[in-house]
Interface confidence: low
Amino acid sequence: GCLTQLYENAFFRGGDVASMYTPNAQYCQMRCTFHPRCLLFSFLPASSINDMEKRFGCFLKDSVTGTLPKVHRTGAVSGHSLKQCGHQISACHRDIYKGVDMRGVNFNVSKVSSVEECQKRCTSNIRCQFFSYATQTFHKAEYRNNCLLKYSPGGTPTAIKVLSNVESGFSLKPCALSEIGCHMNIFQHLAFSDVDVARVLTPDAFVCRTICTYHPNCLFFTFYTNVWKIESQRNVCLLKTSESGTPSSSTPQENTISGYSLLTCKRTLPEPCHSKIYPGVDFGGEELNVTFVKGVNVCQETCTKMIRCQFFTYSLLPEDCKEEKCKCFLRLSMDGSPTRIAYGTQGSSGYSLRLCNTGDNSVCTTKTSTR
Amino acid sequence: IVGGTNSSWGEWPWQVSLQVKLTAQRHLCGGSLIGHQWVLTAAHCFDGLPLQDVWRIYSGILNLSDITKDTPFSQIKEIIIHQNYKVSEGNHDIALIKLQAPLNYTEFQKPICLPSKGDTSTIYTNCWVTGWGFSKEKGEIQNILQKVNIPLVTNEECQKRYQDYKITQRMVCAGYKEGGKDACKGDSGGPLVCKHNGMWRLVGITSWGEGCARREQPGVYTKVAEYMDWILEKTQSSDGKAQMQSPA
């Protein structure tokens, strides 16, 4: 189920799958929600620790049991991922942080009159992930009203420093507020060049596009279909970026499909989940559980309810069925995508709907914070 | 909203505009999306106009002037006015609207979380009121959704300011001693939301007040936490699953 409570003065011990810097616990929670394996997180505000390297530290954690031991740590904030929390699942983060400088690669500097204008510039720049703004009262006169647009390899700051008269925040592209607009077109038999930022396996180009949309550095992608000439590259989804923000070249190529991230769309973003079921397809991955259920839809529901389940395969092989029920293989992987995709099998596969934001789950659970 | 500022897209995705289409079409009240098929608003919005088919509910919008005849809207399946609401009083000013068709959630149209039943222990320090209502007492409906940050006022303090009315435990008040910021005509039914532990909750429903933004005259809101049993009872579907964002 969905758990939204935060535990103050508590830190989860162990289970680390990733760490990064975030300005507050809510942003850390959002990163946990979108991380394929993160179930729990712990955040260390600046006031909670003297170690400068761990200030603003956000620690993403996994656990086979869904929980980890809590240790007392003054000032720390811990909580759960919002996977399975329906409409609260959003990559949109509007807050502006006063007195904080989020560090990254500064790729653009301009003078603006307000922090809101700086955020708007970041939102309207295809490469900008976050920004810092020096206010009118910044101690160095030449930097006053400077708006620094930034990015980093992971989409989060490379460091966060406490600094008076500086305000920082994130791009509002995930809020569907970009003025850039987006290319909805899918280009058949076309491969894009440029830098690959990640490689995953997907059953079709639409899943590839959604993954690209929610990847911090993916601006466009190329997908190699299941009939691509090189077997080892079939169903490969290459997430790409470039300095200019658009592909520098494209090559006509049979059985490839290319397209763009939809992060810069105005008013609508795709849901961060994949609801389609793929008949005759087997998704390979680490086995989480095997259960007998009646029908592929029930298998998908079972996967969705089991928070660690990322995808599933429902087998229709006679040896995998008892009366009306057949085996439902609940699976996971390091990156949330199948480790292999096989065709021509007797069964169907699909993804967990835990990140779909249309669920009527009890997403507003509240419990008093532990002191 | 008096003393407010323009909202931005998706900032208050639960805010809806309740409009009436008679000879002309006008915004009448605000409301809050609390589930795919449920809107919470003030009962007094329907005084004299409880005809379901004259109402149009616009969700996922920021600017009323963007509404054209082609703008999609929801229609009402059922209006549920609190059984103890009296037209002549401010008590139990709460109503539920069941929409004819469920809405999909997007960044611009998604529900607000409801408080826990009888929530009295939470101290809310970051509360906002939103709406398209008047920006001054003798004003007019605003085009762009307005927002204003207003502190909650204790019921004891509120009662001192409204000697002629009974401020009950089922009401919550908000306002500045000096006035200047408040809800106003046309904001009725809309949300008073407070952010606590990173989560927005629907604390109040804009109900009434003496004038707008007057000194020492806070706005009075229906206290949602006090009506959680009623909301859950009315929104419970036939399969026994609550159809809105309720606390566990």
Epitope: - | H27, L28, P50, S88, E140, Y165, K185, G211
Partner: antibody, heavy 122, light 106 residues
């Protein structure tokens, strides 16, 4: 003291026009829905028209729709009823009315003017 | 449109009598009903709203009941000042009055 004072009535020929006014005092006029109600000689009460506090919404009885127009000027605390294409059956005492309560609502009417007589006759 | 039908049209009674006037709505109006008293040459006076709530300053001998489509106004003990015409009014959807009931001296 709360008061409503109607004016503008008189004798008019069928097809003619009249504009009634209702001057309000003693309350915050702009907060309230205002009504016109009429009463033909020796007959019952008939609701004619209503206008929402901002003036944005107007509602009419079927018998007057398209002929009568209700309006208000909140800065002058005045309610109006523009009556066009008058018929003999429009002959009546015209009252303006509203509901005086702490919380502005639409409701029964507890404050009425004294009425103004409109006679439509050739 | 909602029609309101009052009965009787005329009622003859004496001081001290218990008087009952009924009002029927053509469709359910919940409890959105008011009762008025009107004397010749005067504006109507609100007695009861929300079917049964006595307006401030109205004597307690007046009472109202009913919901949905059937409503009743009762004067428990008729006083000389009560001889007048009584109207019901629905305000569920717009506003409609009944045709009136004249209470006259027997």
């Amino acid at each position: 003291e709360v008061q409503l004072l109607e004016s503008g009535g008189g004798l008019v020929q069928p097809g003619g026009s009249l504009r009634l006014s209702c001057a309000a005092s003693g309350f915050t006029f702009s907060h309230y829905i205002m009504m016109w109600v009429r009463q033909a000689p020796g007959k019952g009460l008939e609701w004619v028209s209503g206008i929402y506090s901002s003036g944005g919404i107007t509602v009419y009885a079927d018998s007057v729709k398209g002929r009568f127009t209700i309006s208000r000027d909140n800065s002058k605390n005045t309610l109006y009823l523009q009556m066009n294409s008058l018929r003999a059956e429009d002959t009546a005492v015209y009252y303006c009315a509203y509901r005086r309560i702490g919380v502005p609502r639409r409701d029964a009417f507890d404050i009425w003017g004294q009425g103004t007589m409109v006679t439509v006759s050739s | 449109d909602i029609q309101m039908t009052q009965s009787p049209s005329t009622l003859s009674a004496s001081v001290g009598d218990r008087v009952t006037i009924t009002c029927r709505a053509s469709q359910s109006i919940s409890s959105w009903l008011a009762w008025y008293q009107q004397k010749p040459g005067k504006a109507p006076n609100l007695l009861i709203y929300k079917a049964s709530t006595l307006e401030s300053g109205v004597p307690s001998r007046f009472s109202g009941s009913g919901s949905g489509t059937e409503f009743t106004l009762t004067i428990s003990s008729l006083q000389p000042d009560d001889f007048a015409t009584y109207y019901c009014q629905q305000y569920n959807t717009y506003w409609t009055f009944g045709q009136g009931t004249k209470v006259e001296i027997k």
